[in-house]
Interface confidence: low
C-alpha cells in the first residue's frame, strides 16, 4: 500500500498545532433530523444549512426548520430562522441558489393544505435577508433559474400548470396549462413538453413539444408525438414515437427546434430508453438500452451535428430498476470517461477511454496491489472502479469517483483489483495521470475530497463508530498525517468543501449522541497554515497530458492536439491560492486515422484503427435524413472526430449530397410545426 | 424459448455413481451460471453448487465437496452434475437452474435461479 | 454459512384472502434475496429477485419487501393457483441457501 507516516515521509511540520489553532466547532441547537448545505456563490464564505425535524403526531406531522448563515466557511454559524419567519421548509425542494454569483436564494415553505397556493421566501443579497412572497399556485418542482438570467424563473404547478416570474419571484405568471415537463435552454427559451387529452402519463408518446423565446407572449410548437426531450450541449433531443407501432426514435435539433434530423441510432422499444450521458457543444454520448430487462445497453458518440453516432462500447451497464450508470466524466483531464460493462459471465468490469469514446481499455493494475479472488490468473488483472452502481447495491462504498478540472491529472476512486469489480471492502486508489496509472492510496473505504486545487487532500475513513480522525496528505495521496479533530468522537455523516476543490476549508458534519438527545455539529478546519507560503515558479513541473510513449513524436495526442501543463510538485509544500488558474501549453498534431471515427456504415474490428464496412450495408448506398430530406453519404468510412484539432497528415474523403427526397421517417419535418401567440 | 431439459430417472445402487445432464437451449449457455439443486421425497431445496460456464469454475456446498463434480461442454451447451458413492439418502429430484451471481464478483440482479429444468429422479436402493 | 429461517412452516388461507410470509436470514444478505413457488410435482417457480422485483410475468398480487435480515413476501389476494410451498433464497453468498419453506394451503 502507499507509505503511511513512516521514514519515506516528510512530515509536515507542526501541524497539530497549526490545525488545532485552525480548527472551528459549532453545535447546532437541533433535535437531530436532517440537515442540508448550500454554498451561495463562489469565493463569497456564505454557506446556508437547514435543519429540519419531523414528529409524527396521531393525525399528522408536526414539523420544525432551522436556517442557518455563515460568512467564514462554515466556521461560524448564526441562526436566522426569524428572518423566514420561523417557517417550516420544505426540504424536498432544497435550497434554490441562483446561478454564478447572482447571491438569490429561493425557499419553498410548507402550507397548511387549505390554502390557495404556496409560499416562497427570496434572497438576492447572499441570505442576509429574505423577503415572503405568497404563491397564486402550489408548486411541484424547485423553482428554476434561467441560466442567462437570474431573475427570470419558472416553476411547474401540482396543477401542471407552467409558471415563470419575470422578477425573482415576486410576480407569477401562468403562461401555459397541462405541462409535463419544462427546461430552461439558452437566451431565456424555455421548452416545455404539453398534454392534450388525460394525463403526461396517459399521453406519453403523443405529447407535443412547445418553445417560448418571450417569456410567454409566444409559443411555437416544435414537435409532436413527443415521448421525452432533453438538453446536452448545444442539441435538443426528442424521443419521436414511431407512426405503426409502439416504437420510438431520437431526432436531435441544433436551431432550438427549427429544424430536426433523425438521429442515426437504433429505434427502442415500449420498455427500453435512451439517455444522454454527457455532452459538449462538440458532441454526444448516448446510452441506448437493449431490449429485455437485460442492464445493458450500448453506448454511441456523435458526430458534430448529433445525426452520425458510432458505436462506442458495448454491454454498457445501465440497470433499468434503479437507473443506475457508473458513466463518469474525468474532468482533470481532457477526453477521460469511466464506465462499467457487463460481461458475458453477468460480472462487472469497469472500461476507460482517454480519447472521448474512440476505444475503451480495462484500467491498469495498481503497481503496488495483488489481484484479488475474482481474477483466474493472480499476475494479471485491472483496477475495478466502484461507482453509482455499487452505491446502489448498498456494498462498503461511501463515495463515487473523484476529479476536479483545475487539480489536473488527479482522480480518486473506490476500486478493487481484479477481472471484475468485487463484494468484498473496497481501497481508495488515486491516480495523477488522469486514469494512466493508478495507486493505492487508502487501504479501505473513506470519504475524500480535493482542497487547494489539488495541494491538498483529505480523507475521513468510513465506520459504523464515531470517528474523531482526518487524514490529510500534501503529496497527492503518497504520504498521510492524521489529526485529531475533536476529544469526543461524532457520528459522521458528511464532508463538505467548496464546490471547484479552490477552498482550503474542510467541514466535518455529523452528530453526537447523550443519553436523551442527539445534536448536530460541524468542525471546520482551515489548512491555510499547514501551506504556509504561495507556491513559486520553482514549485511547478512541466507535465505532458496523455503520455505513453515519449520517444514518439506523436506522444500526447489526443483528439489532435497534445496539452503540456504547469504541476505542482508533489514534494511542495504550498497554497495554490482562490486565484490559481491551471497553466495549459497546447499543440496541434498531424492527422492519423486515430482522429477519424467510422462514418455511417462502418465500423472499427477490435485492435483495429482501419475501419470497414458493416457487412449487413455492403453494397448499400447509404443514406440518411438530414432536416427532413433524404441525403446520399459517400465516404470511404471515416469522419473527424468533433472537437479534434488535428491538421494534415491523413486526410480521408467524405462528401455528402442531398437526394432531393424527403424522408418518411422524420415526424419531426417543419410542415409539422406551428406557432401561436398568447 | 429458453429452456433447461435433463436427462431421464436413474435407479443406483450404494457406492455408485450417478451423472445427470442439463441441455440448455434459447440463450448464450456461456452467460449464465448454472446451479444444482436437489429436493429429496417431501423434503425442501437444497443447494448443491454452480458452474461458470464460460470458465468452468465451480462452486460447491461443503456438504457434497469430495463427492460432487460439475462440469459443462460448451459446444452443445449441456452441463453436467456427477455425484458418486451415493448412499440411500441421496434418492431425490435433481434440478438444473440458470442463475446470475457470483461470490466475488458484483454481478447485476444476483437474480436467483430464474429458469429450471424439469427435474431428474434418483433413486439409490440396494 | 447463512442459515435462512421462514416462518410459518404452514400457513392456511382463504381464496381471496392476504398472505405475508416471513424469511429470516442469519446475517445480513443485503437485497439479495429470491423467492420461489413450487407446486407439488412441479420445479420451482422463480418469484421475486432483488428482494423486491417481479419476475417476469409474475402477478402484481406477489410483492416482496424487506432488506438486511428480514424479509416478506406478500400474496395480497389469494386465488387458487396460489396455493403452493414458498421458498426463499439467499443470493448473497456461497452456498446459496435456501429457507425451508412455507406451505400455504386452503384453509
Known amino acids: 500500500s502507499a507509505p503511511g507516516e513512516d521514514e519515506e515521509c516528510g512530515r509536515v511540520r507542526d501541524f497539530v498545532a497549526k490545525l488545532a489553532n485552525n480548527t472551528h466547532q459549532h453545535v447546532f441547537d437541533d433535535l437531530r433530523g436532517s440537515v442540508s448545505l448550500s454554498w451561495v456563490g463562489d469565493s463569497t464564505g456564505v454557506i446556508l444549512v437547514l435543519t429540519t425535524f419531523h414528529v409524527p403526531l396521531v393525525i399528522m406531522t408536526f414539523g420544525q426548520s432551522k436556517l442557518y448563515r455563515s460568512e467564514d466557511y462554515g466556521k461560524n454559524f448564526k441562526d436566522i430562522t426569524d428572518l423566514i419567519n420561523n417557517t417550516f421548509i420544505r426540504t424536498e425542494f432544497g435550497m434554490a441558489i441562483g446561478p454564478e454569483n447572482s447571491g438569490k436564494v429561493v425557499l419553498t415553505a410548507e402550507v397548511s393544505g387549505g390554502s390557495r397556493g404556496g409560499r416562497i421566501f427570496r434572497s438576492s443579497d447572499f441570505a442576509k435577508n429574505f423577503v415572503q412572497t405568497d404563491l397564486p399556485f402550489h408548486p411541484l418542482t424547485q423553482m428554476m433559474y434561467s441560466p442567462q438570467n437570474s431573475d427570470y424563473l419558472l416553476a411547474l404547478s401540482t396543477e401542471n400548470g407552467l409558471w415563470v416570474s419575470k422578477n425573482f419571484g415576486g410576480k407569477w405568471e401562468e403562461i401555459h396549462k397541462a405541462v409535463c415537463l419544462a427546461k430552461w435552454g439558452s437566451d431565456n427559451t424555455i421548452f416545455f413538453t404539453t398534454y392534450a387529452n388525460g394525463s403526461c402519463k396517459a399521453d406519453l408518446g403523443a405529447l407535443e413539444l412547445w418553445r417560448t423565446s418571450d417569456l410567454g407572449k409566444s409559443f411555437k410548437t416544435i414537435g409532436v408525438k413527443i415521448y421525452s426531450f432533453g438538453l446536452g450541449g448545444r442539441f435538443l433531443f426528442a424521443s419521436v414515437m414511431a407512426d405503426k407501432d409502439t416504437t420510438r426514435r431520437i431526432h436531435v435539433s441544433t436551431d432550438q427546434g427549427d429544424t430536426w434530423s433523425m438521429a442515426q441510432l437504433p429505434s427502442v422499444g415500449q420498455e427500453q430508453f435512451y439517455s444522454i450521458l454527457a455532452a459538449n457543444d462538440d458532441m454526444v454520448f448516448m446510452h441506448v438500452d437493449e431490449p429485455g430487462d437485460t442492464g445493458f445497453g450500448t453506448i454511441f458518440t456523435s458526430d458534430d451535428r448529433g445525426i452520425v453516432y458510432s458505436k462506442s462500447l458495448d454491454r454498457h451497464l445501465y440497470t433499468t430498476t434503479g437507473g443506475e450508470t457508473d458513466f463518469t466524466n474525468v474532468t482533470s483531464l481532457r477526453g477521460v470517461y469511466i464506465t462499467s460493462v457487463l460481461s458475458e459471465d453477468n460480472s462487472i468490469q469497469t472500461m476507460i477511454t482517454f480519447d472521448q469514446g474512440g476505444r475503451w481499455t480495462h484500467l491498469r493494475k495498481p503497481e503496488n496491489s495483488e489481484c484479488d479472488a475474482t481474477a483466474k490468473n493472480k499476475n494479471e488483472c485491472s483496477l475495478h472502479i466502484h461507482a453509482s452502481y455499487s452505491i446502489s447495491q448498498k456494498l462498503n462504498v461511501p463515495m463515487a469517483p473523484l476529479s476536479e478540472p483545475n487539480a489536473v491529472g488527479i482522480v480518486i476512486a473506490h476500486g478493487s483489483v481484479g477481472d471484475a469489480i468485487s463484494v468484498m471492502v473496497p481501497d481508495v486508489y488515486i491516480s495523477d495521470d488522469g486514469g494512466y496509472s493508478w495507486t493505492k492510496m487508502l487501504e479501505g473505504p473513506h470519504y475524500y475530497t480535493i482542497l487547494d486545487s489539488g495541494g491538498i487532500i483529505v480523507a475521513i475513513e468510513h465506520s459504523s463508530r464515531p470517528i474523531n480522525v482526518i487524514k490529510f496528505s500534501t503529496d497527492e495521496g503518497q504520504c498521510w498525517q492524521t489529526y485529531t479533530f475533536t476529544r469526543d468522537p461524532i457520528y459522521f455523516t458528511g464532508l463538505a468543501s467548496e464546490p471547484g476543490a479552490r477552498s482550503m476549508n474542510i467541514s466535518i458534519w455529523g452528530f453526537t449522541e447523550s443519553f436523551l438527545t442527539s445534536q448536530w455539529v460541524s468542525y471546520t478546519i482551515d489548512f491555510k497554515d499547514i501551506l504556509e507560503r504561495n507556491c513559486e515558479e520553482k514549485d511547478y513541473t512541466i507535465w505532458l497530458a496523455h503520455s505513453t510513449d515519449p520517444e514518439d513524436y506523436e506522444d500526447g495526442c489526443i483528439l489532435g492536439y497534445k496539452e503540456q501543463f504547469l504541476r505542482l510538485r508533489k514534494s511542495s509544500v504550498c497554497q495554490n491560492g482562490r486565484d490559481y488558474v491551471v497553466t495549459k501549453q497546447p499543440s496541434i498534431c498531424l492527422c492519423s486515422l486515430e482522429d477519424f471515427l467510422c462514418d455511417f456504415g462502418y465500423y472499427r474490428p477490435e485492435n483495429d484503427s482501419k475501419c470497414v464496412e458493416q457487412p449487413e450495408l455492403k453494397g448499400h448506398d447509404l443514406e440518411f435524413c438530414l432536416y427532413g430530406r433524404e441525403e446520399h453519404l459517400t465516404t470511404n468510412g471515416y469522419r473527424k472526430i468533433p472537437g479534434d484539432k488535428c491538421q494534415g497528415g491523413v486526410n480521408p474523403v467524405r462528401e455528402v449530397k442531398d437526394l432531393k427526397k424527403k424522408c418518411t421517417s422524420n415526424f419531426l419535418s417543419p410542415e409539422k410545426q406551428n406557432s401561436k401567440s398568447n | 424459448q429458453v429452456q433447461l431439459v435433463q436427462s431421464g430417472a436413474e435407479v443406483k445402487k450404494p457406492g455408485a455413481s450417478v451423472k445427470v445432464s442439463c441441455k440448455a437451449s434459447g440463450y448464450t449457455f456461456t452467460g449464465y451460471y448454472m446451479h444444482w439443486v436437489r429436493q429429496a421425497p417431501g423434503q425442501g431445496l437444497e443447494w448443491m453448487g454452480s458452474?461458470?460456464?464460460?470458465?468452468?469454475?465451480?462452486n460447491y456446498a461443503q456438504k457434497f465437496q469430495g463427492r460432487v463434480t460439475m462440469t459443462r461442454d460448451t459446444s452443445i451447451s449441456t452441463a453436467y452434475m456427477e455425484l458418486s458413492r451415493l448412499r440411500s439418502d441421496d434418492t431425490a429430484v435433481y434440478y438444473c437452474?440458470?442463475?446470475?451471481?457470483?461470490?466475488?464478483?458484483?454481478?447485476?440482479?444476483?437474480?436467483?435461479?430464474?429458469?429450471w429444468g424439469q427435474g431428474t429422479t434418483v433413486t439409490v436402493s440396494s | 454459512e447463512i442459515v435462512m429461517t421462514q416462518s410459518p412452516a404452514t400457513l392456511s388461507v382463504s381464496p381471496g384472502e392476504r398472505a405475508t410470509l416471513s424469511c429470516r436470514a442469519s446475517q445480513s444478505v443485503s437485497s439479495n434475496l429470491a423467492w420461489y413457488q413450487q407446486k407439488p410435482g412441479q420445479a420451482p417457480r422463480l418469484l421475486i429477485y432483488?428482494?423486491?422485483t417481479r419476475a417476469t410475468g409474475i402477478p402484481a398480487r406477489f410483492s416482496g419487501s424487506g432488506s438486511g435480515t428480514e424479509f416478506t413476501l406478500t400474496i395480497s389476494s389469494l386465488q387458487s393457483e396460489d396455493f403452493a410451498v414458498y421458498y426463499c433464497?439467499?443470493?448473497?453468498?456461497?452456498?446459496?441457501?435456501f429457507g425451508g419453506g412455507t406451505k400455504v394451503e386452503i384453509k
Open positions: 437452474a440458470r442463475g446470475v451471481g457470483s461470490t466475488v464478483t458484483l454481478a447485476y440482479y444476483y437474480y436467483g435461479m430464474d429458469v
Open positions: 458452474i461458470n460456464p464460460n470458465s468452468g469454475g465451480t
Open positions: 432483488g428482494a423486491s
Open positions: 433464497q439467499q443470493v448473497a453468498n456461497y452456498p446459496r441457501t
